[in-house]
């Protein structure tokens, strides 16, 4: 079998809401993945599991099941949303994210995603990690190319 390639493209949008009393930030982060099937047969994308970390703490998880079929030598773009919560010991971030005196409230999040594909009864898992800036101060839609430069934040392999 030839390879199945998974490419994390970046954050597509981040929608933010707050609970001022409990100093909690809710961020719904939609990410985009490109999955390429380099085989001459169809491949099933069984599931995508994702998690988001802030400051080494997992702040959100998501799992999508029975997602799609990718035809021979085809590529599909898949969006998935991870609901995240920044609260409690990280609630100091509430003050930063709601600070009116600054325009952009970027925080660095680590996006982790694992794609499970299946063909002829065989399963394969491909994982990606990427650091991304996300604005926690307002609803933002990103140009996907825009987030590429964050590769500089990737720890060296």
């Amino acid at each position: 079998p030839r390879s199945i390639e998974v490419k994390y493209i970046g954050v597509k949008s981040a929608y933010v809401s707050y609970d001022a009393e409990k100093r909690t930030i809710y961020l719904n982060i939609t990410n985009t993945l490109n999955i390429t099937n380099n085989n001459y047969y169809s491949v099933e994308v069984e599931n995508i599991t994702a998690q988001v970390q802030f400051s080494k703490t997992v702040i959100g998880k998501a799992r999508l099941n029975n997602i799609t079929n990718i035809g021979p030598l085809d590529m599909k773009q898949i969006d998935y949303t991870v609901p995240t919560v920044i609260a409690e010991e990280m609630s100091y971030m509430y003050d930063f994210c709601t600070l009116l005196s600054i325009k952009v409230h970027n925080i660095v999040l680590m996006m982790q995603v694992t794609v499970t594909t299946a063909y002829f009864g065989h399963s394969e898992q491909i994982s990606q990690e990427r650091y991304q800036y996300v604005d926690c101060g307002r609803n933002t839609t990103y140009q996907l190319a825009q987030s590429e430069y964050l590769n500089v934040l990737q720890p060296q392999q």
Epitope: D19, A20, E21, K22, R23, T24, Y26, V85, A87, E88, S91
Partner: antibody, heavy 119, light 112 residues
Amino acid sequence: QVQLQQPGTELVKPGALVKLSCKASGYTFTTYWIHWVKQRPGQGLEWIGNINPSNGNTKNNERFKTKATLTVDKSSSTAYMQLSSLTSEDSAVYYCVRGDYYGTSYPFWGQGTLVTVSS
Amino acid sequence: DVVMTQTPLSLPVSLGDQASISCRSSQSLVHSNGITYLHWYLQKPGQSPKLLIYKVSNRFSGVPDRFSGSGSGTDFTLKISRVEAEDLGVYFCSQSTHVPYTFGGGTKLEIK
């Protein structure tokens, strides 16, 4: 240390209104939400609502929506609750309470104001 | 509104005994941020209530370690390992997960 000063008693006539005060000291007034809690003699506790002193935003118990109006005066670090159209049912001790940093529990309570509605 | 049901209403104990108070909520007290906002207060006659335990099991500063809180979801318990005279009064549980915030009806801890 944190203090919430409330007047001891208020005697008011039925149908009238009363404005209860709660003067805060010993901390940054705008950082912590202020809650108001009602306790009728020998009874349980009832949450009336709360207010964010930094911007005046309030959350109310629907039961008290037309009864209680919460305000703050940042310059004097004082929270107020106005009770209107008073009846004997409103006779109670009213506590002002400071929330914790996360706005969730009530670590600091005033001594309470006893409101007596009587003609 | 979330109804908080405390049992028993009255709890006669001997000094040095263990005391246990139950608090049950009519719906889960897990907030959308994953935190359970269930607290315990003690009110002595003629005084304001005092915070004992916050967020299920955290003792407030200055509260003796004979007080402990436990539970999850809708069932919660306050335990006093060795009751002392200063512990007598009315205990209230309280939730601040759902608006309006609500209190239990109270449990009176008294000497047998």
